[in-house]
Amino acid sequence: SYTTSFCHQLRWVSKRSFKNLLGNPQASIAQIIVTVILGLVIGAIYFGLNNDSTGIQNRAGVLFFLTTNQCFSSVSAVELFVVEKKLFIHEYISGYYRVSSYFFGKLLSDLLPMRMLPSIIFTCIVYFMLGLKPTADAFFIMMFTLMMVAYSASSMALAIAAGQSVVSVATLLMTICFVFMMIFSGLLVNLTTIASWLSWLQYFSIPRYGFTALQHNEFLGQNFCPGLNATVNNTCNYATCTGEEYLTKQGIDLSPWGLWKNHVALACMIVIFLTIAYLKLLFLKKYS
Amino acid sequence: SYTTSFCHQLRWVSKRSFKNLLGNPQASIAQIIVTVILGLVIGAIYFGLNNDSTGIQNRAGVLFFLTTNQCFSSVSAVELFVVEKKLFIHEYISGYYRVSSYFFGKLLSDLLPMRMLPSIIFTCIVYFMLGLKPTADAFFIMMFTLMMVAYSASSMALAIAAGQSVVSVATLLMTICFVFMMIFSGLLVNLTTIASWLSWLQYFSIPRYGFTALQHNEFLGQNFCPGLNATVNNTCNYATCTGEEYLTKQGIDLSPWGLWKNHVALACMIVIFLTIAYLKLLFLKKYS
């Protein structure tokens, strides 16, 4: 039994982690600067998307890049519990706090803000430079989706790395996982064409859920053959003229559930991965 | 002046490097196994490409993946001169060999075979599983293109890493370079839509040359609207019914020079990067 409550311990761990973050701001500031620069570069490359076939390619391309970038950037989250492993074991055994207090304290003070920032920065910069769908709900759905991708990827990193002593193996494993997840995200291969004995792998792909949600959010209702004189040409039938046609070709459900089920899946993955990470920390004591 | 000729020294360095390679086969065998597995996985995912809009997406996707995979795999080439840096300085100062002998010896025995193998393996496995263009010249052009991409990416790795003492900085720099090169390769963004003040960056992108060559090689003469006569003049700006239309939309020159200029560009990059790497080794002595 502990002399202090869970909430008191949570506050204490959070405060210390946050102080460490502010006391060593180089990493945080560097991450923000890199994100801003990358956001501006992406914004400049894709500036002012067209409503034609190049507009389809560029929209899909930039949404794919943002999703996979969120995943690969989250690999750095492997350090969260690895770097302080010895300190955690020492303090936990000394009765300073519960595992749960340490776990949630670190998440709240470190993971939550550091994974939220890039999503906010990217969306604010990229959205208006590219001229994505000009509605408030679409803007916030994009921001929320990028956050969910970052959190699920980071949670996966924690689940793999928690309790380990070296970062490198976890990093390698994460990178390999994300490469395969990236293939199954839906840009490099049309998911409707994959053989059934392999296609189930798409359901384990974090970027697939993020990319599908971002596409659903952006493509729905878009016209990619605007003003095409529809009285003339038959070969135009092979064009993808609406966002709905594009989404259907990608095997994406057009209903509202077709959007939100991706966030539900990401939320489930976050819960599962964080549970694994928590259990790995919990069983650390037995082997230390 | 040296008592032995350049050719003798070259043979000696090559033989020693090759013996090291055979004496420690785990790395080489591991690389081959990983390449075979990845080739089979890619072959299974993309098995039997269709001749419709999904066929366009899947062809572009797999060619993009193979190109970028060749680039990112080549990051490991940074180790070639870094790991043996102290040994090289010691032996060079002791008059064992010329810088040129060591340089070309290492290239011939280590870089040449280890970068050639993945290209051969990938092409042999993927080409027939996917059902790419069934002509011998297209098969060997693909193999040659993947080799050229691997060599230029490895040369860039050597140019960055030569003379350095630690691998990590060079690896990070390479990865960042390849991420930007990947954006400019032509899948994630339609290169014809990039603003002129930025579009010149595509000419420094290794995967762009590889991807363009592979697409030119594969798409030319293909029909993606089965049932529509491919010779019909398509005045619809939005439909992509032939490989030529697809290539034109991507801003790719349809002439034979539109294919071979990519290999010329990659060859020039190889020469430039290897020259930089050689000069960096040459000037190492001054600072050691």
């Epitope: 409503n51 769908k133 000009p134 509605t135 209702g221 878009q222 016209n223 990619f224 053959c225 605007p226 003003g227 095409l228 529809a230 009285t231 038959n234 135009c236 039938n237 064009a239 003229c241 609406t242 046609e245 259907t248 | -």
Partner: antibody
């Protein structure tokens, strides 16, 4: 010259299904384009309802997606509209038209007035 | 949905007059706007697409202008057969129509 003609009952009871047919002459519906249903309410407001493409792909107005269905009979060169659970609000003149995607409509049917009333 | 607002809802003009009808979009629709003419008991007839392109077979007295959110249909010299209701349609995002302007002769 392509011609489109709507047909169907002029009176439908609330909560029932509205079914309309569009017969196309002068062009085969599987050869191309998107075959669209629109309606004009008594207050002059026009609404795009959805389409079925030459390939059979259907696209509906999100506000109607839960109760609309567009189908076709290629042998008769006809396409159909079914609107379920109608209310008096669905009273309108229903048009079929040809276009590509969301683009302007150069070809229209004459329109058929459907009244929803008990 | 993008709201399309047409003004005025009723317009009276004399034969030979230059007449301008306005259509405002709730948000930017680029130049993806079409104009239709609908006479009583008839289906709508496409006049203008892409804001200013005249549909084949339409008299040259009809012209369209505007981009973004503000658009105008102009009849350079009003004819008796031009009495009708005029609709605008945006096709930038999904497709929506204006509520129409009824044009009559004084």
């Amino acid at each position: 010259e392509i011609q489109l003609q709507e047909s169907g009952p002029g009176l439908v009871k609330p909560s029932q299904s509205l079914s309309l047919t569009c017969s196309v002459t002068g062009y085969t519906i599987t050869s191309g384009y998107d075959w669209t249903w629109l309606r004009k309410f008594p207050g002059n407001k026009m609404e795009w309802m959805g389409y079925i493409s030459y390939s059979g792909f259907t696209n509906y107005n999100p506000s109607l997606r839960s109760r609309i269905s567009i189908s076709r009979d290629t042998s008769k060169n006809q396409f159909f509209l079914q609107l379920n659970s109608v209310t008096t609000e669905d009273t309108a003149t229903y048009y079929c038209a040809r276009t590509r995607g969301y683009n302007p409509f150069p070809y229209w049917g004459q329109g058929t007035l459907v009244t929803v009333s008990s | 949905d993008i709201q399309m607002t047409q003004s005025p809802s009723l317009l009276s003009a004399s034969v030979g007059d230059r007449v301008s009808l306005s259509c405002k979009a709730g948000r930017n629709v680029n130049n993806y706007l079409a104009w239709y003419q609908q006479k009583l008991g008839k289906p709508p007839k496409l006049l203008i697409y892409n804001s200013n392109s005249l549909q084949t077979g339409i008299p040259s007295r009809f012209s369209g202008s505007g981009s973004g959110t503000d658009f105008t249909l102009t009849i350079s010299s009003l004819q008796p057969e031009d009495v009708a209701t005029y609709f605008c349609q945006q096709y930038n995002s999904w497709t929506t129509f204006g509520s129409g302007t009824k044009l009559e002769i004084k």
